[in-house]
Amino acid sequence: LPKAPVITTPLETVDALVEEVATFMCAVESYPQPEISWTRNKILIKLFDTRYSIRENGQLLTILSVEDSDDGIYCCTANNGVGGAVESCGALQVKMKPKITRPPINVKIIEGLKAVLPCTTMGNPKPSVSWIKGDSPLRENSRIAVLESGSLRIHNVQKEDAGQYRCVAKNSLGTAYSKVVKLEVEVFARILRAPESHNVTFGSFVTLHCTATGIPVPTITWIENGNAVSSGSIQESVKDRVIDSRLQLFITKPGLYTCIATNKHGEKFSTAKAAATISIAEWSKPQKDNKGYCAQYRGEVCNAVLAKDALVFLNTSYADPEEAQELLVHTAWNELKVVSPVCRPAAEALLCNHIFQECSPGVVPTPIPICREYCLAVKELFCAKEWLVMEEKTHRGLYRSEMHLLSVPECSKLPSMHWDPTACARLPHLDYNKENLKTFPPMTSSKPSVDIPNLPSSSSSSFSVSPTYSMT
């Protein structure tokens, strides 16, 4: 008698390894004999597809060499014209030993930056990825993390992170190891001991001492008033990545002496500078107890940056404050030629206002520091990339000894304008009352305005208070 098809062995989930055989069985009872068709993910499998073998009147489907793309839902449908067609479905789960598809590569990185060593894997079950440094498993911490992708991310790379690394991918079917790669950490040139300023008598001998470090070991050059040192003897020694340079001078005139430590990172150079003044006792006659005096700015470098007729603080710890501060600014500006066009005008404004600080006249003339928020805006908004390099080039700390030997102020040590808006100075070219900042104005006219995030207003401010708009 005619009998509608019944699937007596429903399809089950099949686990298969890549390149192995996988078989689905769909046992059917019916009369007359049914026609059996197979689908994968609802797409008909053609009888002549050479990747499959269909036998036993269609009841056995064999995948001859499983690929990772074969996973999915397989269904058999039986129909003999009696009653309706019947269907049974089962899943194919392709299992795969771990495979490292993007292995790590050798990396040279500068200390303080972020390093990422790739390690992309394949496998089913999904492999877990761990890393080995040298001969030991690598421990994750607040700086070192294995990302979801398997890559190793190291924030704020330190010298001790240098070494040999390999990644390990592991699942229940096996383990794969990457080749060993090398992480090399380079360190910006940094001055460990700065030359000290001296106030000496005419005809004295003075030895200026400068010590620097970095990876690779930096070279040290000496500059006298902006030019290569013309007289004096230099002695150098290198030990444990530290270079020590001594410049011996016969003093016949005051001068600003700068020690420049330079090392190379690929095609780029990093430099650190420290300066010392040599003043001759009779030449310098500062007023008693005063660290400096107020005067109108008469220099050239900061003409476009400082407010017109700005009263600036001149530091009498220099023999010739105007010349020395102008030279400091000049040297710093030359460094800025290589920074981005977005950063440069902002950095120039910051440097000029930091070296030639606004001056509050009175019984004791007082320099007025830049407001912290202006410094932070330059640091975080305009010069985020360059700031790290600039910090390395400056003396650590906002004030080093009794002089500003700066290139970059330490923003956190400046007063906030949220406290006392009169106790700190704004950068004249920044109109902080607007919030849709894109660029900092080039220093051409005396007072251009620009759209920049608003900072606190004060009654003594010379800037107009315009409406503020929230940033999106």
Partner: antibody, heavy 124, light 107 residues
Framework: EVQLVESGGGLVKPGGSLRLSCAAS????????MNWVRQAPGKGLEWVSS????????YYADSVKGRFTISRDNAKNSLYLQMNSLRAEDTAVYYC?????????????????WGQGTLVTVSS | DIQMTQSPSTLSASVGDRVTITCRAS??????LAWYQQKPGKAPKLLIY???SLESGVPSRFSGSGSGTEFILTISSLQPDDFATYYC?????????FGQGTKVEIK
């Protein structure tokens, strides 16, 4: 996890002294400006004093100027408030609170974290 | 010192209500205003800074607006957890000052 824990509160007679401490953990204390804020029982909040990260800048409310001294020890992750010549009107819960800058790096977020407070009672 | 005035002092509302609290400054503070929430026996919690910037972790039903001398805190749909006292605070310049507070209670 950022934590600020005040201590040193208690009962003191008018004209007396008290020293409050605030122990900070879970952040780089030496990088942040810190504050004291107080709240009299059943009343509103009043800013008392602020100190910059390196102690270079210190500010006081007029009501406490000359009587209170704020200080910090970055090595010990601690903030202090030395209160002298105490008056009945200084009775309040004293909170220490942190200032920080938001993700832009230059917009101030005042008092983004607070301690649980310590009660100071000035009474004869 | 800059005076900060909040209104109303007390506000009765129901869950789901839209609530607005106003804060006025005695002189312009640009947008240097913060809002805090305080529950009985607890420390205040920063909700909004720079007049309209939402502090991380604060539900988006809280929003702030205004600049100069007039500011508003809005709770778009009041939740049971929102019954508390709210303070505004100016930080344009020291002395930093707070409003007297607005207590949001169940109607």
């Amino acid at each position: 996890e950022v934590q600020l824990v005040e201590s040193g509160g208690g009962l003191v007679k008018p004209g007396g002294s008290l020293r409050l401490s605030c122990a900070a953990s879970g952040f780089t204390f030496s990088s942040y400006d810190m504050n004291w804020v107080r709240q009299a029982p059943g009343k509103g909040l009043e800013w008392v004093s602020s100190i910059s990260s390196s102690s270079s800048y210190i500010y006081y409310a007029d009501s406490v100027k000359g009587r209170f001294t704020i200080s910090r020890d970055n090595a010990k992750n601690s903030l202090y408030l030395q209160m002298n010549s105490l008056r009945a009107e200084d009775t309040a819960v004293y909170y220490c609170a942190r200032d920080s800058y938001d993700s832009s790096g230059y917009y101030l977020r005042p008092f983004d974290y607070w301690g649980q407070g310590t009660l100071v009672t000035v009474s004869s | 010192d800059i005076q900060m005035t909040q209104s109303p002092s007390t506000l009765s509302a129901s869950v789901g209500d839209r609530v607005t609290i106003t804060c006025r400054a005695s002189q312009s503070i640009d947008n240097w205003l913060a809002w805090y929430q305080q529950k009985p026996g607890k420390a205040p919690k920063l909700l909004i800074y720079k007049a309209s910037s939402l502090e991380s972790g604060v539900p988006s039903r809280f929003s702030g607006s205004g600049s100069g001398t007039e500011f508003i805190l809005t709770i778009s749909s009041l939740q049971p957890d929102d019954f508390a006292t709210y303070y505004c605070q100016q930080y344009n310049s020291h002395s930093w000052t707070f409003g007297q507070g607005t207590k949001v209670e169940i109607k």
